[in-house]
Each structure stands twice: as structure tokens, then as C-alpha cells.
Interface confidence: low
């Protein structure tokens, strides 16, 4: 058993039929010695008396809020949550496996630049009685600070018969050094509690590996005289690290016909302009990627040819 | 060429070669993003290669103040990786394919380090740790890890030279 926060405790249980469970001793937080009784949740049934209560925790029915009273007055509470371990593996019932970029990916994180700011998100089908708490650090043996905000519900989607809920959190490294080469990964830890079930999820990454720039901005076409060619120009996204002479991007320009089956023409360039042939009903799209490190491409910015 | 005491390197040449190094490092190990090498244990391997750290003066301001600190750090790293790529980690079994970019990568590391250090001047060079994998699979894993950290190292070096070429060239 360990303390998650004040008056909230997590009991770790090996989860199999007829498992013996864990013996837990609860102590009433009071100077009183006599006349103390114990109850569980809303029930008025007295479970025991005295300053301590010993219970055998085997299943969710044994978890919940234990309260000690004296003469009708509440003295203190202890909330017991369960963390299940099945076949040596901690349960992952609360979050959905996003399966990208690999199986057992419950947390996904992205950064728009090298400032040390990043966003993580996760999915669940659970809509109520759900809380999350997020901690992060750089490195684990001698951790350096990363500050995370509160996790918030950021999207709801319908997937078949189910509703899916996306939660996200923003974190910022306290002493970020954008120009340095990272040697210790960022660690992100999410505590999830659904009703009386506790689970924890972790992710470890370098900022450089989760970089995904915003799409290029101010995408414009300038027709060239007496020609089907156009000059496409764009700018670095506002959110990208500066100076751009140091934090450089490379770009992919694509001409795409109306039909998905039509051949796509692609040009790669380090400049912020390119000359392409604009076909009727086609569109021109541009996306960006770090010039020197192959992290994710941005989403496309697009304009129609006409 | 970077000479302690002050003269500038050939920023544009360094920029071109460092960008080529980035391309080669990724073509030598392109699928690296799909393999989380930190799960493979012994993560300290990548802590025992030279990292360009916060105090090394490789940020835009540090380069403006005195690029020598940073250039020395980059030179040290290039020599380190050049020696690793020439060691039995890469020359031993399993053999690299004849058209593997590792040979080119090795030569380019040497080329860039020579651009930074003229004949007759010696910055302090680094002792290479004895990384001695006994099994071919361990050697393969070590190659991946070294290439992975090399990708990060040359990315920072390429940013330095790009910025230098744009803002510090005479």
C-alpha cells in the first residue's frame, strides 16, 4: 500500500481467482483513543471499533472511503484504490491503446518547436468518475523539472457505437535549452483513477523525436506570364523556433489533382518558394519538416490552383 | 578552418558537408523512429558519446560571442564518432552491405573534422571507450544506438554551420 495523495491510498493486488489479497491496517487520524467506530462509503454498518481497523483487501468491494467516527462526528477518512496486476502486468483498462507508432501506446506527445513545451494526449471510452494527474521530468535518476498543467477534455468523437474522449495536457520544461543536443529523455507519468481503480501510464521521449511543426503560413500563388507555371511562396509558421537561420525547415510542395488517383507531383526544397505547373482543378499543398532531423512532417497547408 | 585564437572556419563548406552528414546518418539508419532503443537496456551507451550541451556555446548567442568553444566541441564529437564508425563495432560481423552509407558517413565525418582543424594544430582529442560487444546481435544493437545518437549530434552541428554561414561568414 502507498499514499497517492493525502488520505488516498493505493493497494496493489495480484489479480487472480482466490487470490489472498493484501492485509491493510487503517489508523484513525485523531488524538482520541476510545469510542471510535469505522464505516465504509455511505453504509452505516459498523465494520469495527478502535483507533485502527485491519481489513483484508481482495476485490473492489473492499475498496472505497473508510471513515472513522466518534459519537456521530467524523474524525478522518481514508480512500482505498486498487491497482490490479494480472500475470505480472499492471492493468491498462482505463486508456485506449492508440497503436501508433507501435502497440501499447497509450500516451502520445508532440512539440511544435524546441522551446521545451509539448502536449500529450490520450483516449478513453469512459465518460464519468474519471480523474487524471500528470507529472513530468527530464531524466529519472536525477530529474530536472518539467511543469505540467491540468489534464482537460479536449475532444469527443463517435466511433461506431462508442463515444471516445480525448484528454490532453500541456507541459513546459523549466530550464529548456533549445539549441542543445538532448541526452536524457523527458519522462511523462499519468495517474488515472476511474471510480476505485488506479492505473498509471508512462512515456519517455526526446523533444527532437516528437517535433511536428505547424503547417507553413501565408501560402500564395503568383502566376508566371505566358505559362502554366506558378510561383508558390509561403512562410515559416509563427510557432517554429527562431532564428530560422539556425532552426531551419525543409519543405515538400505537392500538386494534387481533384481525383486521388491522379499522379501527385512533389518537389522538395529548403527555400520558401518553388515553381510548379498548376493543372486545372488541382490544388497545391506545402508541408514542413525539421531540415536536419527527420521527425514528423507538418500537416499540409493548401490552396486551389484556379 | 577554425584555429584557436580566432580565425573563422569555412562556414559554407562546413554547412554543406554537415547537411550531407545529416542525410547520410538517416540513410544509414532510416527506420530508427520505429525502434525505441531506450527500451533495449544499457541506455548509458548514448550518454558516453559527446553531447553538445547547454554550456557549450553552440546556441546563436554563444556562436556570436565566441564560436571557438562550440567548434572545438563539434570537432571533438566528429573525431569520436569517426573512430567509433571505424571500430570493430562497424567492421565486425554482421558485415555491412557493400553499398552501406556507413562508409560514406565515416569519410564525411573525417572530412568535416579536417575542415575544422588545420594541419599542424591539435585540439585535445578524446579517448574512445572500449565498447566491446561479444555477440553479433549486441554489435547490431550498438550500431543502431551509435547511429541514433549521431543523428542527433550532426543535426545540432548542421544548425551551427547553417547559422554561421548565414550570419558569421566574412
Amino acid at each position: 500500500i502507498w499514499e497517492l495523495k493525502k488520505d488516498v491510498y493505493v493497494v496493489e493486488l495480484d489479480w487472480y481467482p482466490d487470490a489472498p489479497g493484501e492485509m491493510v491496517v487503517l489508523t484513525c487520524d485523531t488524538p482520541e483513543e476510545d469510542g471510535i467506530t469505522w464505516t465504509l462509503d455511505q453504509s452505516s454498518e459498523v465494520l469495527g471499533s478502535g483507533k485502527t481497523l485491519t481489513i483484508q483487501v481482495k476485490e473492489f468491494g473492499d475498496a472505497g472511503q473508510y471513515t472513522c467516527h466518534k459519537g456521530g462526528e467524523v474524525l478522518s477518512h481514508s480512500l482505498l484504490l486498487l491497482h490490479k496486476k494480472e500475470d505480472g502486468i499492471w492493468s491498462t483498462d482505463i486508456l485506449k491503446d492508440q497503436k501508433e507508432p507501435k502497440n501499447k501506446t497509450f500516451l502520445r506527445c508532440e512539440a511544435k518547436n524546441y522551446s521545451g513545451r509539448f502536449t500529450c494526449w490520450w483516449l478513453t471510452t469512459i465518460s464519468t468518475d474519471l480523474t487524471f494527474s500528470v507529472k513530468s521530468s527530464r531524466g529519472s535518476s536525477d530529474p530536472q523539472g518539467v511543469t505540467c498543467g491540468a489534464a482537460t477534455l479536449s475532444a469527443e468523437r463517435v466511433r461506431g457505437d462508442n463515444k471516445e474522449y480525448e484528454y490532453s495536457v500541456e507541459c513546459q520544461e523549466d530550464s529548456a535549452c533549445p539549441a542543445a543536443e538532448e541526452s536524457l529523455p523527458i519522462e511523462v507519468m499519468v495517474d488515472a483513477v476511474h471510480k476505485l481503480k488506479y492505473e498509471n501510464y508512462t512515456s519517455s521521449f526526446f523533444i527532437r523525436d516528437i517535433i511536428k511543426p505547424d503547417p507553413p503560413k501565408n501560402l500564395q500563388l503568383k502566376p508566371l506570364k505566358n505559362s502554366r507555371q506558378v510561383e508558390v511562396s509561403w512562410e515559416y509558421p509563427d510557432t517554429w523556433s527562431t532564428p530560422h537561420s539556425y532552426f531551419s525547415l525543409t519543405f515538400c510542395v505537392q500538386v494534387q489533382g481533384k481525383s486521388k488517383r491522379e499522379k501527385k507531383d512533389r518537389v522538395f526544397t529548403d527555400k520558401t518558394s518553388a515553381t510548379v505547373i498548376c493543372r486545372k482543378n488541382a490544388s497545391i499543398s506545402v508541408r514542413a519538416q525539421d531540415r536536419y532531423y527527420s521527425s514528423s512532417w507538418s500537416e499540409w497547408a493548401s490552396v486551389p490552383c484556379s | 578552418r577554425a584555429v584557436p585564437g580566432g580565425s573563422s572556419p569555412a562556414w559554407t563548406q562546413c554547412q554543406q558537408l554537415s547537411q550531407k552528414l545529416c542525410t547520410l546518418a538517416w540513410s544509414a539508419h532510416p527506420l530508427v523512429g520505429h525502434m525505441d532503443l531506450r527500451e533495449e537496456g544499457d541506455e548509458e551507451t548514448t550518454n558516453d558519446v559527446p553531447h553538445i550541451q547547454c554550456g557549450d556555446g553552440c546556441d546563436p548567442q554563444g556562436l556570436r560571442d565566441n564560436s571557438q568553444f562550440c567548434l572545438q566541441r563539434i570537432h571533438q564529437g566528429l573525431i569520436f564518432y569517426e573512430k567509433l564508425l571505424g571500430s570493430d563495432i562497424f567492421t565486425g560481423e554482421p558485415s555491412l552491405l557493400p553499398d552501406s552509407p556507413v562508409g560514406q558517413l565515416h569519410a564525411s565525418l573525417l572530412g568535416l573534422s579536417q575542415l575544422l582543424q588545420p594541419e599542424g594544430h591539435h585540439w585535445e582529442t578524446q579517448q574512445i571507450p572500449s565498447l566491446s560487444p561479444s555477440q553479433p546481435w549486441q554489435r547490431l544493437l550498438l550500431r543502431f544506438k551509435i547511429l541514433r545518437s549521431l543523428q542527433a549530434f550532426v543535426a545540432v552541428a548542421a544548425r551551427v554551420f547553417a547559422h554561421g554561414a548565414a550570419t558569421l561568414s566574412p
Partner: nanobody
Framework: EVQLVESGGGLVQAGGSLRLSCAAS????????MGWFRQAPGKEREFVAR????????YYADSVKGRFTISRDNAKNTVYLQMNSLKPEDTAVYYC?????????????????????WGQGTQVTVSS
């Protein structure tokens, strides 16, 4: 704070062997690189060997290469220095030390000032 205790020193004839141990208490060593140094009477403390956290990367002073082997057992929280073909010039007090930084820091591993925790030392005397 980590406490380091060296053992295994003693008097040995030239050509002989000794195995030094460095046991840690107070904190696990598995997150840290560890080094051995030695100090002969009237001389500066000098670098002998260093081993990285998981034992993959190892450095030796030129004077001991091929004769000394550094190793570690993280489960036992212990670092070892196997010393073979000992010479009279290996006579010194041998110290083990913890490197606080997980970063590679150039030649800093050679400098005693780079290490933040030290043992009391164990005397090794090699007679001719």
C-alpha cells in the same frame, strides 16, 4: 548521500593480482558512472579507470590498459577493479568515486574534481 567503502587492498609481490571492491550504501549506484583513482605518496591523485552506468563504456589510463579490468554488479551495488601483473609503480592508495553526471563531458572523467563522492581508500603495496 551515497557512502562508498573500498576493500581488497593489501601487500602483493610484483606480477601478482588483487581484486578491489567498492560497495555503496545510501543510494543505488546503477544510475551513475563510477571511477577508480589512485594516489601514490607525494603524488597527485590520478585516474585509473571509469565504467558507465550499465557497464557498456569503459575507459582506462594508458598505464594500466591490458592489466586492470573495471566491472560492476548493479544488483550488488558494487564496482570492482581486477588488477593483474601488478608492478611496484602501482603502489598507492586506491579510491573509488561516483560521477554525478550522466552526460559525456569530454576528458572530464580523467579529473578527480568531476566526481562528487569518494571512499576512504584502500592501500595497495606491490613489492619487488
Amino acid at each position: 548521500e551515497v557512502q562508498l567503502v573500498e576493500s581488497g587492498g593489501g601487500l602483493v609481490q610484483a606480477g601478482g593480482s588483487l581484486r578491489l571492491s567498492c560497495a555503496a550504501s545510501g543510494r543505488t549506484l546503477s544510475s551513475y558512472a563510477m571511477g577508480w583513482f589512485r594516489q601514490a605518496p607525494g603524488k597527485e591523485r590520478e585516474f585509473v579507470a571509469r565504467i558507465s552506468q550499465g557497464g557498456t563504456a569503459i575507459y582506462y589510463a594508458d598505464s594500466v590498459k591490458g592489466r586492470f579490468t573495471i566491472s560492476r554488479d548493479n544488483a550488488k551495488n558494487t564496482v570492482y577493479l581486477q588488477m593483474n601483473s601488478l608492478k611496484p609503480e602501482d603502489t598507492a592508495v586506491y579510491y573509488c568515486a561516483k560521477d554525478p553526471s550522466p552526460y559525456y563531458r569530454g576528458s572530464a572523467y580523467l579529473l578527480s574534481g568531476s566526481y562528487d563522492s569518494w571512499g576512504q581508500g584502500t592501500q595497495v603495496t606491490v613489492s619487488s
